[in-house]
Amino acid sequence: SQPSASPGEPSPPSIQPAQSELIVEAGDTIRLTCTDPAFVKWTFEILDVRIENKQSEWIREKAEATHTGKYTCVSGSGLRSSIYVFVRDPAVLFLVGLPLFGKEDNDALVRCPLTDPQVSNYSLIECDGKSLPTDLKFVPNPKAGITIKNVKRAYHRLCIRCAAQREGKWMRSDKFTLKVRAAIKAIPVVSVPETSHLLKEGDTFTVICTIKDVSTSVDSMWIKLNPQPQSKAQVKRNSWHQGDFNYERQETLTISSARVNDSGVFMCYANNTFGSANVTTTLKVVEKGFINIFPVKNTTVFVTDGENVDLVVEFEAYPKPEHQQWIYMNRTPTNRGEDYVKSDNQSNIRYVNELRLTRLKGTEGGTYTFLVSNSDVSASVTFDVYVNTKPEILTYDRLMNGRLQCVAAGFPEPTIDWYFCTGAEQRCTVPVPPVDVQIQNASVSPFGKLVVQSSIDSSVFRHNGTVECKASNAVGKSSAFFNFAFKGNSKEQIQPHTLFTP
């Protein structure tokens, strides 16, 4: 191009032939002349080629397709004029600049300038005749090549050629494969499988951090956050691609023989051009193992005869428990109980053991002790189980001294009440005060039924009737009845019988 200059200003150099473009046939001569009082040089540029010529007349006697390009004349004042020369060669339609890179969301230039501008349908095609992606848009420029607009990740490794029709015949360039660099649009994804670790001194600490990103350019590292002396940790890296834009790296941190002062917080940190991400994991190293049984809300358990009860023990243990056992009354081994890891704790040191006692009998009250041990320590917790039973009237007798006696057993301790009623009454409602109440020791065990003995003086009764002995506690009640009649001045007969009232 040869711009005109304003009067008084230096003019740009003048080129002959005086046109912006020139078409020359291959084998012919290119003759370009630059006229300028302060001529400096000619430059020639095409693709990555740049040549200088200090002669004001540039002559190329046997023009080749590769001589196609932009010829620029430069003057001493820095002004320049250019002409673009096409060297038309029947065998070479495209000049090719490889390789081809693109950045996601940017344009990419497929460098395939033409040696002949008088062609049609200058475009891109897929190497093997398949369709190009439907969203791929391109803009042709005979002097530079074809620009792919707004490169997508999906175009990565797309094989393409430039193509054009010359005199009705399709011509194709060499192959290009587009290598796409993903735009970093998010921070890396960083994860560790466990957020806390508990070890004994001498154990090996290993934790794997997984970093996921779209490209290999992500940086990652393990950092110990605590100010304690830096642990003698080793980091091993493994990485792989799960497809073109799914890159995964594993950073494995290992402390081969952990010490108490290795305890602390370790951070796996990763960053890319978008930002950074991190995840932490806590290491606690203890000198020796432990078992901590969590306080049980109530170790004294009351249960009604025939019902079920669960004895639940929750504890932390490291190393893991080796033996778990339930013992009844300090001797009889019971079933082992159901044990499981409490999964809400990621370090997996929290355990639960559950003893299910079904349809308990009154005789099955007592101490139930849970014993647990690991390689270092043992611990235990004892439950006192009391079985609440409805009172049972064991004996109801008329004694030699004229007293009526009632003996009842149950848990909790039954209360014995006496009532009198005449034969005409449906229920006995008149209370009779006892003359003697004794609580007996039913068994050696404090968990057995409690036996209560109560008696009344029968001489207080002056009428025919019935005496009721009623034993009751929180669970229920039972009754026994004494029927008697007067014959003259003496009680003829006293016949006891029982009636259990639920």
Partner: antibody, heavy 118, light 111 residues
Amino acid sequence: QVQLVESGGGVVQPGRSLRLSCAASGFTFSRYGMHWVRQAPGKGLEWVAVIWYDGTNKDYTDSVRGRFTISRDNSKNTLYLQMNSLRAEDTAVYYCAREDWAEAFDMWGQGTTVTVSS
Amino acid sequence: DIVMTQSPLSLPVTPGEPASISCRSSQSLLHSNGYNYLDWYLQKPGQSPQLLIYLGSNRASGVPDRFSGSGSGTDFTLKISRVEAEDVGVYYCMQALQTITFGQGTRLEIK
């Protein structure tokens, strides 16, 4: 003519550093992805690192990640490999190679020898 | 990483006879673009490696037509139709689908 020439190799103690260079000529260096490949004595080829044409993307084999850094100066047509915390197992002939349009290595340098020994 | 396994590791051949080297990958090297990212290299004694075959079956510039590559997915073969004395050296396959890995190499020697 088109060529790659490595330099900077030598004998170094474990834990020390070394910087290798690869001078490119005869082609437009700034257009090409470049790689380092090494070969331990009597062993096969092992890929080490890659850098994109413009220096934006880099990748390394896992055994050197964090110790080696690949870089380039397109104005000087030169590729570099900064090797820190060297180990005995890093002893090898180091080649630079050019990646072509098909992601193959169409051009290799003559190699430079790195020996890590105490 | 993708593991590349070559066989045989040693290949004695009489000049003029054909030779064949196998290369197997631990996962498919066929990209969705239809190309297998598998290349073959020859390292002659005392020299740098040189590219023979790219994208599974394409001969590199200047490589004699007695060399040919075939295969797809995980199984690939390099064939030399008539071995010449200058073909002696170690042949490597290389995958470029993911992080680059090489096969162990096959040493071709003249009987």
